[in-house]
């Protein structure tokens, strides 16, 4: 059970992760006017990866879109790649996670395959976490810079004579939105790649014993005291008694007539 | 259409105070900024403030700091002026503008309001 | 505070004439966000109040006649008046409504001949 609900928190805490990662990269307000000593101008001014916006103080709103892709600076390029390849992996990583859910059955597949599918979009969550948190950090450290360029050249214009008023940035609402949102598909990616231990079935040197009764067709498994009709496919090279103590999880990882296909 | 409706003087005594007035109509008060412009005789402009009458969120020319109140009453579609202290220097047209919606710039102005101090 | 510089002052034109005047703002009014000009040109008539001609320094208000054109960037703007008529006497203000406070030019009294 605990493996269970530790596959499926992760899974939750990833789509939310992953959801946020996709609204932070779509956000506008990635950098925003500073207007730390009251407003300096009468438009707010703030910038996304993909467009800037100008919101007169009206309230009208005009958003331009960066038309270019050369003359952008590398940073904001590399910001996008990042934040892209993290949305990418991520909804491929939900894609695998999906199918490697213990609550959800598709045809006949082995628990290793699911543990094999949970390990899988684990990695790809946390890549994508990371993804998200670096392409944040990087923009973020750029805005730093820039800030304090500007607040140094703030006053100082040629050979200090002229004064100039500069538009300083700082953090927007969408850095925050990547860095938690970043750091739940990390979280996530974490709980899948515990969940995966849970789910990997433990190697044992005990083989499945069939035992025929005469008038029926019935195999019997004494490990998990769980019968199927006929001689199909999954009385064959099945482990079915490892041993040692057994978990509520891996009970339920056998098919019985309680399993909903 | 818009219309800003001022009255037409106001005669004060030095050291008094006067509030000014700008009935709007012909449009939504609490959408667009309301503007306030001083213009002493045969000089040019100068800008007070401005009052946003929505949620009464100004801003002021430090200058006219202490010197001018800017207040609006959305039951009536107003906005008020109160001029503080007044000297001669403060004897001056005073205009009440609506902020246009896609500038900063100022599209429909009242009359104008002559502010005389004298004792 | 921004300082508008304005010139000349007066400028006496006849009817039917071009006429340019100058605005100059001591510091730039574009704004890199949407490489737009707050800069705008009013023009008031004797005994009137002023009237809004043109906005975001070449953005001709409704109703204006096109012989009115403003045209500038960053610093330095200009307006004309393509073919001047009698009823444009009048002074014309420049206006920055980019920084605040707002600030006005000391105005260009165009004077016709």
């Known amino acids: 059970m605990a493996v269970t609900a530790c596959q499926g928190l992760g899974f939750v805490v990833s789509l939310i992760g992953i959801a946020g990662i996709i609204a932070a990269t779509c956000m506008d307000q990635w950098s925003t006017q500073d207007l730390y000593n009251n407003p300096v101008t009468a438009v707010f001014n703030y910038q996304g990866l993909w467009r800037s916006c100008v919101r007169e103080s009206s309230g009208f709103t005009e958003c331009r879109g960066y038309f270019t892709l050369l003359g952008l600076p590398a940073m904001l390029q590399a910001v996008r790649a990042l934040m892209i390849v993290g949305i990418v992996l991520g909804a491929i990583g939900l894609l695998v996670s999906i199918f490697a859910l213990k609550c959800i059955r598709i045809g006949s597949m082995e628990d290793s395959a699911k543990a094999n599918m949970t390990l899988t979009s684990g990695i790809m969550f946390i890549v994508s976490g990371l993804c998200a948190i670096a392409g944040v950090s990087v923009f973020a450290n750029m805005l730093v810079t820039n800030f304090w360029m500007s607040t140094a050249n703030m006053y100082t214009g040629m050979g200090g004579m002229v004064q100039t008023v500069q538009t300083r940035y700082t953090f927007g609402a969408a850095l925050f939105v990547g860095w938690v949102a970043g750091g739940l598909t990390l979280i996530g990616g974490v709980m899948m790649c515990i969940a995966c231990r849970g789910l990997a079935p433990e190697e044992t040197n005990y083989k499945a014993v069939s035992y025929h009764a005469s008038g029926h067709s019935v195999a019997y498994k004494p490990g998990g005291f769980k019968a199927s009709t006929g001689f199909g496919s999954n009385t064959k090279n099945k482990k079915i008694y490892d041993g040692g103590a057994r978990t509520e999880d891996e009970v339920q990882s056998y098919p019985s007539k309680h399993d909903y296909v | 259409q818009v219309q800003l409706q001022q009255p037409g003087t106001e005669l004060v005594k030095p050291g008094a105070s006067v509030k000014v007035s700008c009935k709007a109509s012909?449009?939504?008060?609490?959408?667009?900024?309301m503007h306030w412009v001083k213009q002493r005789p045969g000089q040019g402009l100068e800008w007070i403030g401005r009052?946003?009458?929505?949620?009464?969120?100004?801003n002021y020319n430090q200058k006219f700091k202490g010197k001018a109140t800017l207040t609006v009453d959305k039951s009536s579609d107003t906005a008020y002026m109160q001029l503080n202290s007044l000297t001669s220097e403060d004897s001056a047209v005073y205009y009440c503008a609506m902020g246009a919606y896609f500038s900063n710039s100022f599209a429909y102005w009242g009359q104008g309001t002559l502010v005389t101090v004298s004792a | 505070d921004i300082v508008m510089t304005q010139s000349p002052s007066p400028l006496t034109v006849i009817v039917g004439e071009k006429v340019t005047m100058t605005c100059k703002s001591s510091?730039?009014?574009?704004?890199?966000?949407?490489?737009?000009?707050?800069l705008t040109w009013y023009q008031q008539k004797p005994g009137q109040p002023p009237k809004l001609l043109i906005y975001w320094a070449s953005t001709r208000e409704s109703g204006v006649p096109d012989r009115f054109t403003g045209s500038g960037s960053g610093t330095d703007f200009t307006l004309t008046i393509n073919s001047v008529q009698a009823e444009d006497l009048a002074v014309y203000y420049c206006?920055?409504?980019?920084?605040?406070?707002?600030?006005f030019g000391s105005g260009t009294k165009l004077e016709i001949r």
């Open positions: 206006q920055n409504d980019y920084f605040f406070p707002f600030t």
């Open positions: 510091q730039t009014l574009l704004n890199r966000g949407n490489q737009k000009n707050y």
């Open positions: 012909g449009y939504t008060f609490t959408t667009y900024w």
């Open positions: 009052i946003r009458p929505s949620d009464s969120d100004s």
